[in-house]
Interface confidence: low
């Protein structure tokens, strides 16, 4: 230990400490001591900066003394004690109460020391994400919208695509007073690739310990994109029964299929069967372009197919078959 | 003195649409939030949506997301509840109600007189 | 869903104290929920009592209060007039929506 006198004593606490929008949260601070040093405490106070008077004071004989009494408290300093633990607790904390205070001792012989500590009054802010449902619109609109509900300081929102776009960010005042409410829009050019996908919203804010990532499944609504599958172009006489396929994508979900030809209603060797198309074996070649309608919410699409039934090849030809 | 004055009764089909007013006074009209809450004959309170008048953002209880558009036309301190493919259940009265300050948050401070929706074939 | 649940109906006295309560099914009440107290008389419009727990609206009688009572938020009448006659609702807010409780009618009787 050093000898008497040679140390200083010296007020801990941390330079910034956070606290939560309507909760309590103690100012830490401390008198460390070294050594054999002898020092008395007569009094602790807290003030803040830019006020006049002190918000709390801790007096050796007369005990405590609050601005606000019913939102101050000395966590650990009591009569009868030595005071070297200045820790004040403060509750229902207030936007108005972010910034600096100064914590001090007044001790003899070594005088008064001080710190500053600066409060910093978070609030933890709500998340959501919701999916804007769309249709073709061929220019560039909202499909995603994230928002984060009364954060302070406001929270950073920003999206991860694959798909190209854009954000388009807000910030409105939030309900309680000081925070602020975050409102973020995905915009893109719809597409029918882009249904289905999804896109992700990142919500950082100083409250959490990760970002908050919320995923969001777009919904694009479009008419029927249609194509016919099943033919080879080796089509042959006298083989087995070949089936065409009509392949639609489109949301909602298609309501009807309608097989005709390009020379009207379907000849007797081809029988519709909802979205597939059943051509039954023919004496004779033909050569025929069949069309496929499909029809969904947003409207009808057709895609059309030219069949050739050729005279037959070696009988071990696979022929007709499809299946 | 802080008034809201709402647009008169209305009355519709099903599947039709209505928009209702709100007509502000005695206050700056874009520095606070106004909501809109409906009460069914007989039924309690059922809030619908705020706007914040100074920016237009807007937040929607989800019963009514895709159905209803909440707007303001600062220049005539006037904020606007349309909802779209009524049905007989939102026969009801509907009121806007501005949010007042104390300092701590936002509160339902002054109610317009309400409007009467009769969704009725 | 939230579910807002309040006394459909309470008495009290003239001069007497009466605490309304609200109820939230998802938990206790905090002041995040930024308690709202409503006022409604027969025949007149709506009016704010109480934002934010416990904060009284400018103009509101000091005979209102607002609290927390354990997990409910409160509204406490002290001293109830014949005019305190009405429907009291309560809204609680849900990070991103307000829901109103059913509503006690107080009779002062």
């Known amino acids: 230990w050093p000898p008497p006198g040679t140390g200083d004593i010296v007020v801990q606490a941390p330079t910034q400490v956070p606290g939560f929008l309507g909760d309590s949260v103690t100012l830490p601070c401390y008198l460390q001591v070294p050594g054999m040093e002898e020092t008395h405490v007569s009094q602790l106070t807290w003030s803040r900066h830019g006020e006049s008077g002190s918000m709390a004071v801790f007096h050796q004989t007369q005990g405590p003394n609050y601005s606000e009494p019913k939102r101050l408290e000395f966590v650990a300093a009591r009569l009868g004690t030595e005071l070297r633990d200045a820790s004040l607790r403060m509750f229902g904390l207030r936007v108005e109460d972010e910034g600096n205070y100064t914590c001090l001792f007044v001790a003899f012989p070594q005088g008064s020391r001080s710190v500053d500590i600066w409060l910093r009054v978070l609030a933890k802010p709500q998340n959501t994400a919701e999916v804007q449902k769309v249709q073709l619109t061929g220019k560039p609109v909202p499909v995603a919208r994230c928002v984060s509900t009364g954060g302070r300081p406001p929270a950073h929102i920003t999206w991860h695509s694959d798909l190209g776009g854009m954000p388009n960010t807000s910030q409105a005042p939030g309900f309680l007073s000081g925070t602020v409410t975050v409102t973020s829009l995905w915009i893109l050019v719809p597409s029918s690739q882009v249904d289905g996908k999804s896109v992700t919203c990142k919500v950082e804010h100083e409250s959490f310990e990760k970002p908050q990532l919320l995923t969001v499944n777009l919904t694009v609504y479009y008419p029927p994109e249609v194509s016919i599958s099943g033919y080879d172009n080796n089509w042959y006489l006298s083989q087995n029964e070949a089936t065409l396929t009509c392949d639609a994508r489109s949301n909602p979900e298609p309501t009807g299929y309608n097989w005709s030809t390009t020379m009207g209603p379907l000849p007797p060797f081809a029988v519709a069967q909802g979205a597939q198309l059943l051509i039954r074996p023919v004496d004779k070649p033909i050569n025929t372009t069949f069309i496929c309608n499909v029809t969904n919410a947003l409207g009808a699409r057709q895609a059309e197919l030219t069949v050739q039934v050729k005279e037959g090849p070696p009988s071990e030809h696979s022929g007709m078959s499809s299946n | 003195q802080v008034q809201l004055v709402q647009s008169g009764a209305e009355v519709k089909k099903p599947g039709a649409s209505v928009k209702v007013s709100c007509k502000a006074s005695g206050y700056t009209f874009t520095s606070s939030y106004i909501s809109w809450v409906r009460q069914a004959p007989g039924q309690g309170l059922e809030w619908i949506a705020w706007i914040y008048a100074g920016t237009g953002d807007t937040n929607y209880n989800q019963k009514f997301t895709g159905r209803v558009t909440m707007t303001t036309d600062t220049s005539t301190s006037t904020a606007y509840m349309e909802l779209r493919s009524l049905r007989s259940d939102d026969t009801a009265v509907y009121y806007c109600?501005?949010?007042?300050?104390?300092?701590?948050?936002?509160?339902?401070?002054?109610w317009g007189q309400g409007t009467t929706v009769t969704v009725s074939s | 869903q939230a579910v807002v649940t309040q006394e459909p109906s309470l008495t009290v006295s003239p001069g007497g104290t009466v605490t309304l309560t609200c109820r939230s099914s998802?938990?206790?009440?905090?002041?995040?929920?930024?308690a709202n107290w409503v006022q409604q008389k027969p025949g007149q419009a709506f009016r704010g009592l109480i934002g934010?727990?416990?904060n009284r609206a400018p103009g509101v009688p000091a005979r209102f209060s607002g609290s927390l009572l354990g997990d409910k938020a409160a509204l406490t009448l002290s001293g109830a007039q014949p005019e305190d006659e009405a429907e009291y609702y309560c809204?609680?807010?849900?990070?991103?929506?307000?829901?109103f409780g059913g509503g006690t009618k107080l009779t002062v009787l």
């Open positions: 109600a501005r949010h007042g300050y104390t300092g701590r948050g936002w509160y339902f401070a002054v």
């Open positions: 809204a609680l807010w849900y990070s991103n929506k307000f829901v």
């Open positions: 934010h727990t416990n």
């Open positions: 998802t938990g206790a009440v905090t002041t995040s929920n930024l």
